[in-house]
Interface confidence: low
């Protein structure tokens, strides 16, 4: 902790500006005063604090807001930000997607900290849900986020937010959480039309059970095959030889490259070898 | 290296007709969807027509559909665009691409990594 002590005749602060950066830490915290530099927050980031110096600033806004920092100063810590802990951080209220935003925006282009992790968890609670507008800004700073969460977690988006969901935000997901994920999905396109409804299920298949998969293969979607090897195997496995055609249409071809790999070992060997030869790619069940 | 090399653009009046081609080597042809996409003066990029390896469930956008047929050649390693009863809006620069990407739909803009520097079409009287 830096020492108490008086300050110098002359270097009170009025304003927060770059003079500061010329005070002594000491200097920072006996002429800096805590109110002063909590209103004037956004004017921070535009000056090259020194690390050391970020360290008293924040103590002085500890000292000031012990029960946790009011969401006015919080939207304002750009850099500052980096110095909290988790502990810090979940003494806070945060309510407001730019306040979110401005935050993620400082620790862009890194991994999730616990910092990051701690401050996501206290929004997403204190909003009850994850919304559309809360899924979208974070998928956009880190498009593993949906798949870093719980099956339990996951059971708290609402199909509305499904909208906000890319392909690419699905690509760490694995079958237990695709498995929350899919029937909110087949909710929320419920009423497109079905090759626009296929574009939007797609990333969602691997938690898709028979009866849907069959479903499909009425519908000319041609599927690919790295969606289709995604697919859970007990949910393939009851497909016949004419559903698996449709359903991968042109890409049919591709079962051969893939006959060693599951789903479709499996499922070969669960076909009647007559049905096989039908496809004419030398499937051997 | 994957090359793509697109051909026969050129002035067209309205309602007149051009045949494109794109040549391509460096990949195994016969085993990849071919996509044939536009881009308008100022406007973005749109998928025009694709067409899986087995040249089966081909796709055009509501735009082209009825007017513009695709068509391959794997014995030559090409793909082909016949334009028929040309628009003042299909002046554009049209590209061809390949490598589709998992989890995208064939005519989808994000779907593939590779692609042609492209052939300029313009429909003017």
């Known amino acids: 902790e830096v020492e108490k002590t008086a300050c110098p005749s002359g270097k009170k602060a009025r304003e927060i500006d770059e003079s500061l950066i010329f005070y002594k830490k000491w200097e920072l915290e006996a002429c800096v005063d805590a109110a002063l530099l909590a209103t004037q927050m956004d004017r921070v980031n535009a000056i090259p604090f020194t690390y050391e110096q970020l360290d008293v600033l924040k103590h002085k806004l500890d000292e000031l807001y012990p029960q946790g920092y009011p969401e006015s100063v919080i939207q304002h810590l750009g850099y500052l930000f980096l110095k909290m802990s988790p502990e810090d951080i979940r003494k806070w209220n945060v309510t407001s997607l730019e306040t979110l935003k401005a935050l993620l925006e400082v620790n862009k282009g890194h991994e999730m900290s616990p910092q990051v992790a701690t401050l996501i968890d206290r929004f997403v609670k204190g909003r009850g849900q994850l919304d559309k507008d809360t899924l979208d800004t974070l998928t956009a700073f880190y498009p593993g986020y949906l798949c870093s969460l719980s099956p339990e977690e996951l059971s708290s988006v609402p199909p509305s937010s499904i909208w906000a969901v890319r392909p690419q935000d699905l690509d760490t997901c694995d079958p237990r959480q695709l498995d929350v994920l899919y029937p909110k999905a087949r909710l929320a396109f419920q009423n497109m039309n079905g090759s626009e409804y296929f574009v939007k299920i797609q990333s969602f298949l691997g938690g898709a059970p028979t009866e849907d998969l069959k479903a499909l293969s009425q519908q000319n979607v041609s599927m690919d095959l790295a969606t289709f090897m995604k697919l859970r195997t007990d949910a393939v496995l009851p497909l016949t030889v004419a559903e698996v055609q449709k359903l991968l249409g042109p890409h049919v071809e591709g079962l051969k490259a893939e006959e060693r790999h599951r789903p479709v070992r499996d499922w070969i060997l669960r076909q009647r070898q007559d049905d096989l030869d039908t496809l004419g790619l030398g499937l051997q069940g | 290296e994957v090359q793509l090399v697109e051909s026969g653009g050129g002035l067209v009046q309205p309602g007149g007709s051009l045949r494109l081609s794109c040549a391509a080597s460096?990949?195994?042809?016969?085993?990849?969807?071919m996509g044939w996409f536009r881009q308008a003066p100022g406007k973005g990029l749109e998928g025009v027509s694709a067409?899986?390896?087995?040249?089966?469930?081909?796709v055009y956008s509501d735009s082209v559909g009825g007017r513009f047929t695709i068509s391959r050649d794997n014995s030559k390693n090409t793909v082909y665009l016949q334009m028929n009863s040309l628009r003042a809006e299909d002046t554009a620069m049209y590209y061809c691409?390949?490598?589709?990407?998992?989890?995208?739909?064939?005519?989808?803009?994000?779907?593939?990594?590779?692609w042609g520097q492209g052939t300029l079409v313009t429909v003017s009287s």
């Open positions: 691409a390949t490598d589709r990407r998992p989890g995208t739909t064939m005519l989808a803009v994000n779907g593939y990594n590779h």
């Open positions: 460096g990949f195994t042809f016969s085993r990849n969807t």
């Open positions: 067409i899986p390896y087995t040249s089966t469930g081909i």
